[in-house]
C-alpha cells in the first residue's frame, strides 16, 4: 500500500547572511488531506516557522501556490537570513483531524548553515608607549562570522609575524563566532613609520581578506639623544652653547637650561625637523655672557620627553680661559635658535 512520504531533498543548505534561503519539501501524495508546517528543531521545544493553515509569517514565502488543490510542493523561502536562523528545519505533514490536526509524517530535515562575514578586524596596541628593544602586544578582534573556519595572519611592514596566539570562540557549535589574537612585536628605533596588520581570511570574503591596522607611531617612544656643544665666540665675552636633541618621538618635549643648577630657561619643542625614519630633531641654544661670571659655569640641558623622567647633558664653561671653540655643531638640522644673555 502506498503511503505519503515527505521528501526534503537537501540535507544541508548554505546561505550568506542577508540573503534568502530556499528550503525544499515535497509530499509524494495528496492523501491524507491536511496542512504542512515547517519547524526549526525537533521535539517539544521546536520552533514553528510556517503554518500553511494559519498564522502570520512575514519572512516566509511559499515557492508554489499552496491554494492549488493538487500542490505537492511545500518549499519555502526565508528572507533576510541571519546567523540566528541556523538550525535544522523540518517539513511536517499533518492529517486533518477534529478538533486538531494530527502530525502524520516528517521530512528528514534540512540543516541551514549561515555564512556570515567577519566584522572588520580591530587592532589595538598597548595602553602605554614603549621604547625600542621592548616587546609589546597587539590584539586583533573580529566577530559575527560563520562558519567557524577562519584564518588570521599578522604582518609588520609586509613581513609575516610568527609570535602570536589565536582563539576562536565559542569552542562548540554556535550561530556565529569571534576570533581574538595577540601578537608580540619587538620595537626598533625605525618603527615610527611601521604598521602592524591583522589579516582575516574567511570563506565569505571570496579571497579578499579583511585587514585591520595599527600604526606603531601610536605605540613607540624613541627617547632623544642629547649633545651639548659650545659654539665659536659670537662677540667678546659671549659664548653660544647649543643643545642638540636628536632622534626623538613623539614630538612632545620640554627643554630646560640650568646654569650651575639653577633654572635659566624652559621651552617646549616647536620648530622641529623630521628625519626620514619619522623621528624628530630639535636644537636649542643659549647665549652666555661669561663676563658676568667669576667662576666656571656648569650648563645643563635637561629634557623631559613625553612625560618621562628628565634626561640631561652638561657642559662645563671655563670663564678663566679666553673663550674658544669647544666642540662643533655637527647637526645639519639646526633650525631652531633661542638667545639668552646672562648678566
Amino acid at each position: 500500500e502506498e503511503e505519503l512520504q515527505v521528501i526534503q531533498p537537501d540535507k544541508s543548505v548554505l546561505v550568506a547572511a542577508g540573503e534568502t534561503a530556499t528550503l525544499r519539501c515535497t509530499a509524494t501524495s495528496l492523501i491524507p488531506v491536511g496542512p504542512i508546517q515547517w519547524f526549526r528543531g525537533a521535539g517539544p521545544g521546536r520552533e514553528l516557522i510556517y503554518n500553511q493553515k494559519e498564522g502570520h509569517f512575514p519572512r516566509v514565502t511559499t515557492v508554489s501556490d499552496l491554494t492549488k488543490r493538487n500542490n505537492m510542493d511545500f518549499s519555502i523561502r526565508i528572507g533576510n537570513i541571519t546567523p540566528a536562523d541556523a538550525g535544522t528545519y523540518y517539513c511536517v505533514k499533518f492529517r486533518k483531524g477534529s478538533p486538531d490536526d494530527v502530525e502524520f509524517k516528517s521530512g528528514a530535515g534540512t540543516e541551514l548553515s549561515v555564512r556570515a562575514k567577519p566584522s572588520a578586524p580591530v587592532v589595538s596596541g598597548p595602553a602605554a608607549r614603549a621604547t625600542p628593544q621592548h616587546t609589546v602586544s597587539f590584539t586583533c578582534e573580529s566577530h559575527g562570522f560563520s562558519p567557524r573556519d577562519i584564518t588570521l595572519k599578522w604582518f609588520k611592514n609586509g613581513n609575516e609575524l610568527s609570535d602570536f596566539q589565536t582563539n576562536v570562540d565559542p569552542v562548540g557549535e554556535s550561530v556565529s563566532y569571534s576570533i581574538h589574537s595577540t601578537a608580540k612585536v619587538v620595537l626598533t628605533r625605525e618603527d615610527v613609520h611601521s604598521q602592524v596588520i591583522c589579516e582575516v581570511a574567511h570563506v565569505t570574503l571570496q579571497g579578499d581578506p579583511l585587514r585591520g591596522t595599527a600604526n606603531l607611531s601610536e605605540t613607540i617612544r624613541v627617547p632623544p639623544t642629547l649633545e651639548v656643544t659650545q659654539q665659536p665666540v659670537r662677540a667678546e665675552n659671549q659664548v653660544n652653547v647649543t643643545c642638540q636633541v636628536r632622534k626623538f618621538y613623539p614630538q612632545r618635549l620640554q627643554l630646560t637650561w640650568l646654569e650651575n643648577g639653577n633654572v635659566s630657561r624652559t621651552e617646549t619643542a616647536s620648530t622641529v625637523t623630521e628625519n626620514k625614519d619619522g623621528t624628530y630633531n630639535w636644537m636649542s641654544w643659549l647665549l652666555v655672557n661669561v663676563s658676568a661670571h667669576r667662576d666656571d659655569v656648569k650648563l645643563t640641558c635637561q629634557v623631559e620627553h613625553d612625560g618621562q623622567p628628565a634626561v640631561s647633558k652638561s657642559h662645563d664653561l671655563k670663564v678663566s680661559a679666553h673663550p674658544k671653540e669647544q666642540g662643533s655643531n655637527t647637526a645639519a638640522e639646526n633650525t631652531g635658535s633661542n638667545e639668552r644673555n646672562i648678566y
Epitope: 500500500e1 502506498e2 505519503l4 531533498p9 530556499t22 525544499r24 515535497t26 509524494t28 501524495s29 495528496l30 492523501i31 488531506v33 515557492v63 508554489s64 501556490d65 492549488k68 488543490r69 493538487n70 500542490n71 505537492m72 510542493d73 518549499s75
Partner: antibody, heavy 119, light 107 residues
C-alpha cells in the same frame, strides 16, 4: 495561450543519452506554479509518466526510470528539458511534454516527438 | 505505484449511444483523478479533472464521477468525433500513473 513544442533528435544510438527540449511560448515558464512534465508512449501502447519539475526546481522522477532521468529548466530560454541516459530499443517512443496548470490535470501538451533508438 | 485498471480495453458503439468506461485504483485516491482523450497521431487532451470537473472548452456530453477507488467516465451521446482512446490518470500519489486506455470505435 500557452503552447509547448518538443525538439530533439529523432534517432539515438543504443547506450547514448536521449536529449529533448520543450519550448514554452505564450507565457512564462516561471509564472504561476505549474508542474512541467514529460510523458512517453511506446508504439501502440499506453501513456507512461516520466517525471516533472516545478517552481522550486524540485524534480520527481518515475522510480522505474529514476536512475537514468534528468529533468531541468532554463528560465532564461523559457525551456525545460529531458535527458535519458543509457537508452535501449525499449526507450523507443513518442515523447510528450505537458503542463499541469492551476487545476489538476495536464491541460497543455506538446504535439509529441518520435524518438527511435537504433544503431 | 498505484495501479489503474481501466475497462473495457476497447468498445464499439453507435452514434448517439451512451458510453461508460470504468477505472479502478489499487487503493483509495479520493477524487484525485483525471480523464484524457487521445486521437490517433495526436497528443492527449484533458477532458475531466478532479474526477468530475469538466475542463475548459470540453462538450457537456462528457462527464465523470466516483471517489475512493472506483471511477466512471461517461459519454452521454457518442459522436463521430469522439473516436479516440480514453485514459484515466491518478495524481494522488507519485508517480502519477495512467490506466491502460479504452479504445472507443463507432459501429
Amino acid at each position: 495561450q500557452v503552447q509547448l513544442q518538443e525538439s530533439g533528435p529523432g534517432l539515438v544510438k543504443p547506450s547514448q543519452t536521449l536529449s529533448l527540449t520543450c519550448t514554452v511560448s505564450g507565457g512564462s515558464i516561471s509564472s504561476g506554479s505549474p508542474y512541467w512534465s514529460w510523458i512517453r508512449q511506446h508504439p501502440g501502447k499506453g501513456l507512461e509518466w516520466i517525471g516533472y519539475i516545478y517552481a522550486s526546481g524540485f524534480t520527481y522522477y518515475n522510480p522505474s526510470l529514476k536512475s537514468r532521468v534528468t529533468i531541468s529548466v532554463d528560465t532564461s530560454k523559457n525551456q525545460f528539458s529531458l535527458k535519458l541516459s543509457s537508452v535501449t530499443a525499449a526507450d523507443t517512443a513518442v515523447y510528450y511534454c505537458a503542463r499541469e496548470g492551476y487545476h489538476s490535470g495536464m491541460d497543455v501538451w506538446g504535439q509529441g516527438t518520435t524518438v527511435t533508438v537504433s544503431s | 505505484d498505484i495501479q489503474m485498471t481501466q475497462s473495457p480495453s476497447s468498445l464499439s458503439a453507435s452514434v448517439g449511444d451512451r458510453v461508460t468506461i470504468t477505472c479502478q485504483a489499487s487503493q483509495d485516491i479520493s477524487n484525485y483523478l483525471n480523464w484524457y482523450q487521445q486521437k490517433p497521431g495526436k497528443a492527449p487532451k484533458l477532458l475531466i479533472y478532479d474526477a468530475s470537473n469538466l475542463a475548459t472548452g470540453v462538450p457537456s456530453r462528457f462527464s465523470g464521477s466516483g471517489s475512493g477507488t472506483d471511477f466512471t467516465f461517461t459519454i452521454s451521446s457518442l459522436q463521430p468525433e469522439d473516436i479516440a482512446t480514453y485514459y484515466c490518470q491518478q495524481f494522488a500519489y507519485l508517480p502519477w500513473t495512467f490506466g491502460g486506455g479504452t479504445k472507443v470505435e463507432i459501429k
